[in-house]
Amino acid sequence: GIAIPRNSGCPNSEDKNFPRTVMVNLNIHNRNTSTNPKRSSDYYNRSTSPWNLHRNEDPERYPSVIWEAKCRHLGCVKADGNVDYHMNSVPIQQEILVLRREPRHCPNSFRLEKILVSVGCTCVTPIVHHVA
Amino acid sequence: GIAIPRNSGCPNSEDKNFPRTVMVNLNIHNRNTSTNPKRSSDYYNRSTSPWNLHRNEDPERYPSVIWEAKCRHLGCVKADGNVDYHMNSVPIQQEILVLRREPRHCPNSFRLEKILVSVGCTCVTPIVHHVA
């Protein structure tokens, strides 16, 4: 077979299960300052499906702080400020990548992990189940 | 500052700017099958601020496919199906981590990158600017 082109400066990779462990450069490219989302947008307050942001902190994880959205109401807020329970506030979730220290407390050894986070809430029409 | 406890089995990291490059185990923990979000939830269609999902693929990035939400309307959909332009559909954005191959042809060298993605849309009351 044809060999994979390889730069002479590449780490070695003869293991048949390669790459299980890779070198990752943490000088983050395209970085936007990751601040409390309350500062970057007030949608959480102005939405018809408003949410609260809960700080999820884990010193063994990168990023160590993740903000989780929790919808304030089961229903959606109407123009008059009352909650309409004929509609539903639901969390919009996304799977994200994080780095977890492994072994624990080792500053430069990590495992890639996928976690599901709630980013915000949206107002949806409920699914009505009709009983025969 | 408080020193990070160090296991004797940890890789060495004397660089004062440490960690610039870390070892990452890519056997992903907590994996949920990462599929087209259209299959995992129909909120994008049922929301009062519905959105379309656009495929953003990059063969040199992990995850290689990211689904981007684009709000369908400027306004929000009312119960009768018409759009209310006194309200606004807005994207909920989140900064996520991705891995990008670096140097270009090294199969086990990556750079961590932050990108901003739109996860879904929510309906908000507009900010009205009153002219004096």
Epitope: - | P59, Y62, S64
Partner: antibody, heavy 120, light 112 residues
Amino acid sequence: QVTLKESGPGILQPSQTLSLTCSFSGFSLNTFGMGVDWIRQPSGKGLEWLAHIWWDDDKYYNPALESRLTISKDASKNQVFLKIANVDTADTATYYCSRRELGPYFFDYWGQGTTLTVSS
Amino acid sequence: GVLMTQTPLSLPVSLGDQASISCRSSQSIVHSNGNTYLEWYLQKPGQSPKLLIYKVSNRFSGVPDRFSGSGSGTDFTLKINRVEAEDLGVYYCFQGSHFPYTFGGGTKLEID
């Protein structure tokens, strides 16, 4: 050395389901960044990309055929499978599997192909 | 999807001559990341395709330097200097910048 080999039924009747197997060696689908694609080529014609599966079980299909395609894998056996439902004479082709790595190019190794004839 | 159009359909050449194959895409295939995922494959008679060129102009490992790729946006060219007998077959361009991925219709390189 990376090798891939396709196998299939050879002949099917219209409306049957095609089951193809790609058996490979020299790499693992337990490895980060590895994937396998299916591509087909009707006799004397060009190439058409069908489907792809990544090591983490992420799957993608050609939208023109998506409703009929199912790709899956058994990483422990070094195999990838493709099913095509409700075949027709237009599905008569040589079917190739190829390896893909997360990186700057797509299909770096190909199998020899397996031929399917759909005939009543 | 993106339509990839190759010209000519058939290219008769004499051994030792230069051959040039054109591939045109129906829209720009510059990816949002700045790269152009345009590849060239050669399928020799009775064989499966083999990767020659990736990202417009990069030769894959083991590919002789008489093969070169060029172009940008929507227009791409594969050139073969000093054609040898082992170069005969059908050449396909391929784009991986926009989903779903698409191949050109092929150009058959044959002896004049």
